[in-house]
């Protein structure tokens, strides 16, 4: 299931003397497309241009992150007169052109979405040959990837003075709320660290001092689901070691 916000248009005038107001470079992309991790999403992009009946070589490009300079994730090229845009680059083989660039459509399908795909994407078309021109969406389309929580790490670590602390890291979008439960704890939200920079979908919760032996469970929950994982603490009493 994919949700697309209402289209906005990037209408940009081309200053070529021979181009009338009706024939100008513009790109139509929605501001945002939402889809769940594991699913596929379609990034729509259509364009208009001032070069009537252009049938020369063309290249269609999608890049991520920022316009003009972000890394390419997809590129295909169509020879003069050809409707087939041959893929030259598809990052991890997950990007596929749905549209026909000859018909002013650069729409892209992204398969097997992951949270790391949550970023802004920019479509671009380049004409080569007799006419040589290019244009890229400057605002792009934000791909918003949602995901049920997944606990990626749970561990018990030594603390000063022979104490122990527990850490739980989960990912999800929206970022999940984390709670710890365990001996003499009840349900505790614990010290939740904000998502780390560059790891926007990761949340960590810490139990600073484990006072009792037994099973400690971390629960991660967001609007799409919940996940839990447990860790066991057993200290050898009379010794300074512990088994987890």
């Amino acid at each position: 299931f994919v949700r697309t916000k209402i289209d906005t248009t990037e209408n940009l005038l081309n200053t070529e003397v021979h181009s009338s107001p009706a024939q100008r470079w513009s790109m139509q992309v929605p501001p945002e497309v939402s889809a769940e991790a594991g699913d596929a999403a379609v990034l729509p992009c259509t364009f208009t241009h001032p070069h009537r009946h252009y049938d020369g070589p063309l290249t269609a490009i999608w890049r991520a992150g920022e316009p003009y300079a972000g890394p390419q994730v997809f590129r295909c090229a169509a020879a003069r007169g050809s409707e087939l845009c041959q893929t030259a680059l598809s990052l991890h083989g997950r990007f596929r052109l749905l549209g026909n660039p000859r018909r002013n459509d650069l729409s892209l399908r992204v398969e097997r979405l992951a949270l790391a795909d949550d970023r802004r994407y920019f479509c671009r078309v380049e004409f080569a040959g007799d006419v040589h021109d290019r244009y890229e969406s400057r605002h792009g389309v934000r791909l918003h990837v949602t995901a049920a929580p997944r606990i990626v790490n749970i561990s018990v670590l030594p603390s000063p003075a022979h104490a122990f602390r527990a850490l739980c890291t989960a990912e999800g979008e929206p970022p999940p709320a984390l709670a710890w439960s365990g001996p003499a704890l009840g349900n505790s939200l614990a010290a939740v660290r904000s998502p780390r920079e560059g790891h926007g979908h990761l949340v960590t919760a810490e139990l600073p001092a484990l006072t009792h032996d037994g099973r400690y469970t971390c629960t991660a929950a967001n609007s799409l689901g919940r996940s839990e994982a447990s860790v066991y603490l057993f200290r050898f009493h009379g010794a300074s070691g512990a088994s987890t």
Partner: antibody
């Protein structure tokens, strides 16, 4: 760090051929157009040729069309310029450059001198 | 071909003073709003050219903010405030709008 390193040029007689190459590193080679720009002794910069991402499209300045061939090997991250029927006016330092379109000729090699003389 | 005309051909500047270089194109380099294909390069003596400014006014990576580009359509200016000894060299404007891609003839900056 982006690096572009041209091969050695040299002295060549008029009418003869020479091939220049440029080894690139520090960026995703196939994501960019590449170009050759030359500079005659004590003169300004003159664009020579450009090649598209997958070598599907090449552009040349009129004075070298039919004599020079620009090519690239994305697997080896190398750019080449085959120069045939060389003339004395082709004498120049040749630079390979990464052509970023909206970002200009963003990175340049150190340059290699080609002298065409009998 | 688009002709890029630079003025002056050379200028001599006192350290700490400002310098201004003009570049005029024979055709508008405005492709669409916010997208103008004009660039400035500096070639220091015995070195390769280096990108200074892209798309009229954007500073390239590592370029000090003493350099400022401005202009539109056919008239462009590179201004260097507080000129330093290391700024000597030849400054070129260039266009990437149309093939053949062209450069100005260069402006030589010297320190008094």
């Amino acid at each position: 760090e982006v690096q572009l390193v041209e091969s050695d040029g040299g002295l060549v007689q008029p009418g003869r051929s020479l091939k220049l190459s440029c080894a690139a590193s520090g960026f995703t080679f196939s994501d960019y157009y590449l170009a050759w720009v030359r500079q005659a002794p004590t003169k300004g910069l003159e664009w020579v040729a450009s090649v598209s991402y997958d070598a599907i499209t090449n552009y040349y300045r009129d004075s070298v069309k039919g004599r020079f061939t620009i090519s690239r090997d994305n697997a080896k991250s190398t750019l080449s310029l085959q120069m045939d029927s060389l003339r004395s006016e082709d004498t120049a330092t040749y630079y390979c450059a990464r052509q970023d379109w909206e970002g200009g000729f963003a990175y340049w090699g150190q340059g290699t001198l080609v002298t065409v003389s009998s | 071909d688009i002709v890029m005309t630079q003025t002056p051909l050379s200028l001599s500047v006192t350290p700490g003073a400002s310098a201004s270089i003009s570049c005029r194109s024979s055709k508008s380099l405005l492709h669409s709003p916010g997208l103008t294909y004009v660039f400035w390069y500096l070639q220091k003596p015995g070195r390769s050219p280096r990108l200074l400014i892209y798309r009229v006014s954007n500073l390239a990576s590592g370029v000090p903010d003493r350099f400022r580009g401005s202009g539109s359509e056919t008239d462009f200016t590179l201004k260097i405030s507080r000129v330093e000894a290391e700024d000597v060299g030849i400054y070129y404007c260039g266009q990437l709008l149309e093939n053949p891609f062209t450069f100005g003839s260069g402006t030589k900056l010297e320190i008094k």
